[in-house]
């Protein structure tokens, strides 16, 4: 016997050939011998089955002696052994309809797990293995879980079902709901304007929620919220914002924060969090802002940082086309009775310069220049 | 529910191959046939040809020395490709879902034969 | 082939009169025709299926009758959005064919 794999929802084409390559009389049947489909002439005939309005035949090929089965929007109580009557020829089919569904919303946060769900008709025995969009296999019966969603598991994951060395295949659409970045850095001098983006690593038509910016600066002995907002259909409307400092937002996507002077006292981490209609939980990341400044008193010029910097970060203070005079994994550097010039302050990771300020050291008898 | 794209060369000239793809959106590609059929300016609808998912063709006796349909099921694709065409294969070509009736059509590709 | 000849070739009406479009088949095709509504810049839409059929979506004031060789569509009351070029089609045999279609204008 034939058999015949079909997914849920699907159309299926089950063929029966007749050994005349002419137009003559058939009928398919179910196991229970129900009619189901036939011809009288060039009529096409539908029997009392449950099928009935999600049959069909293709008239055209009748004259080449095929006698086509076509169920519509199969359903996985369709599993069944269909039985085609041409002439003196009997051929059976069997029918065997697969479904496979994601546990709730194919739209899911970072972190949270998926749960795949195989229906199958009663008597099967199909295994099912399925890829995810970053090439991770994963096997399983009728049930495939992935617990800890990462970014890179959005997209589509191509999941087949093995049943009597016969395969079909299905294509689900996984959305990750995360920012593009977990974390970000800005490296900005002081009285410079800070602007903080959150791209979305995906994209849905409306989108609604609310977030929050709450930041911690290293000065501080606890964090403070410093902005909160809502989200309507991609539209951004601030709801609460702090009087120091006084963030903008930007009305639009992506999620984007402009600092208007970046000061000693912001330098710190913040986290900013999305809550998104009809999820749990919410979406995050984090920011860092780290702060520069270069000064001269008297005769002590001094270069400082503030904020989250790695202690591999090097903080020199140069001569501009000499060598550096000081140079320390340290937040703060000095020269004593610097030589006239200008200066160059630099924070830098493995030689490449991450932040740089510059300041005009003038002849003892003049006050100093900051360009 | 079912959507169909289709793209391909606006303009060609005698004696080249026509060549147009189908992309089917939502819904079944396995158990139904894609046909193709082209209307030449301002006269009828004229069927092509047409193919299954298992690559099972028919196609119209009159076209049928010039004409190749093929299916790439990984990408729930059709193509059309026609050869040798002269001015008379000037038309707005149209992709289609068949059973026995054509439901529903692509947005049709207008194809300029000239030299 | 299958010859399929439709009448008129033209047609003018009004906004809420009846129109009566015939097609006939070179030779008998039971009930394998469909109806087809066709407006120029888009693609054509079916009407009518199994000569008699109405097409999910497509308003009660299109019919179809007919079987053998002779086939009508009817359409009971024109509104605005009908105004177009209808063909009918066999799907009995291969190759499928066409009618050379009747354009319904506006009187």
């Known amino acids: 016997k034939k058999v015949v794999l079909g997914k849920k929802g699907d159309t299926v084409e089950l063929t029966c050939t007749a050994s005349q390559k002419k137009s003559i009389q058939f009928h398919w049947k179910n196991s229970n011998q129900t009619k189901i489909l036939g011809n009288q002439g060039s009529f096409l005939t539908k029997g009392p089955s449950k099928l009935n309005d999600r049959v069909d035949s293709r008239r055209s090929l009748w004259d080449q002696g095929n006698f086509t089965l076509i169920i519509k929007n199969l359903k996985i109580e369709d599993s069944d052994t269909y039985i085609c009557e041409v002439g003196d020829q009997k051929e059976e089919v069997q029918l065997l309809v697969f479904g496979l569904t994601a546990n709730s919303d194919t739209h899911l946060l970072q972190g949270q797990s998926l749960t795949l769900t195989l229906e199958s008709p009663p008597g099967s025995s199909p295994s099912v293995q399925c890829r995810s969009p970053r090439g991770k296999n994963i096997q399983g019966g009728k049930t495939l879980s992935v617990s800890q969603l990462e970014l890179q598991d959005s997209g589509t994951w191509t999941c087949t079902v093995l049943q009597n060395q016969k395969k079909v295949e299905f294509k689900i659409d996984i959305v990750v709901l995360a920012f593009q970045k977990a974390s970000s850095i800005v490296y900005k001098k002081e009285g410079e304007q800070v602007e903080f983006s959150f791209p979305l690593a995906f994209t849905v038509e409306k989108l609604t929620g609310s977030g929050e910016l709450w930041w911690q600066a290293e000065r501080a002995s606890s964090s403070k919220s410093w902005i909160t907002f809502d989200l309507k259909n991609k539209e951004v409307s601030v709801k609460r914002v702090t009087q120091d400092p006084k963030l903008q937002m930007g009305k639009k996507l992506p999620l984007h924060l402009t600092l208007p002077q970046a000061l000693p006292q912001y330098a710190g981490s913040g986290n900013l969090t999305l809550a998104l209609e009809a999820k749990t939980g919410k979406l995050h990341q984090e920011v860092n802002l780290v702060v520069m400044r270069a000064t001269q008193l008297q005769k002590n010029l001094t270069c400082e940082v503030w904020g989250p910097t790695s202690p591999k970060l090097m903080l020199s203070l140069k001569l501009e086309n000499k060598e550096a005079k000081v140079s320390k994994r340290e937040k703060a550097v000095w020269v004593l009775n610097p030589e006239a010039g200008m200066w160059q302050c630099l924070l830098s990771d493995s030689g490449q310069v991450l932040l740089e300020s510059n300041i005009k050291v003038l002849p003892t008898w003049s006050t100093p220049v900051q360009p | 529910q079912v959507q169909l794209q289709q793209w391909g060369a606006g303009l060609l000239k005698p004696s080249e191959t026509l060549s147009l793809t189908c992309a089917v959106y939502?819904?079944?590609?396995?158990?139904?046939?894609w046909s193709w059929i082209r209307q030449p300016p301002g006269k009828g609808l004229e069927w092509i040809g047409e193919?299954?998912?298992?690559?099972?063709?028919n196609y119209n006796p009159s076209l049928k020395s010039r004409v190749t349909i093929s299916v790439d099921t990984s990408k729930n694709q059709f193509s059309l490709k026609l050869s040798s065409v002269t001015a008379a294969d000037t038309a707005v070509y149209y992709c289609?879902?068949?059973?026995?009736?054509?439901?529903?059509w692509g947005q049709g590709t207008l194809v300029t034969v000239s030299s | 082939d299958i010859q399929m000849t439709q009448s008129p070739s033209s047609v003018s009406a009004s906004v809420g009169d009846r129109v009566t479009i015939t097609c006939r088949a070179s030779?008998?095709?039971?009930?394998?025709l469909a109806w087809y509504q066709h407006k120029p810049g888009k693609a054509p839409k079916l009407l009518i299926y199994?000569?008699?059929s109405l097409q999910s979506g497509v308003p009660s004031r299109f019919s179809g009758s007919g079987s053998g060789t002779d086939f009508t569509l009817t359409i009971s009351s024109l509104q605005p959005e009908d105004f177009a070029t209808y063909y009918c089609?066999?799907?009995?045999?291969?190759?499928?064919?066409f009618g050379q279609g009747t354009k319904l204008e506006i009187k």
């Open positions: 289609a879902r068949v059973i026995n009736w054509f439901d529903p």
């Open positions: 030779q008998d095709i039971s009930s394998w």
């Open positions: 089609q066999q799907a009995n045999s291969f190759p499928y064919t």
């Open positions: 193919i299954n998912h298992s690559g099972s063709t």
């Open positions: 939502g819904g079944s590609f396995s158990g139904y046939y």
């Open positions: 199994a000569a008699s």
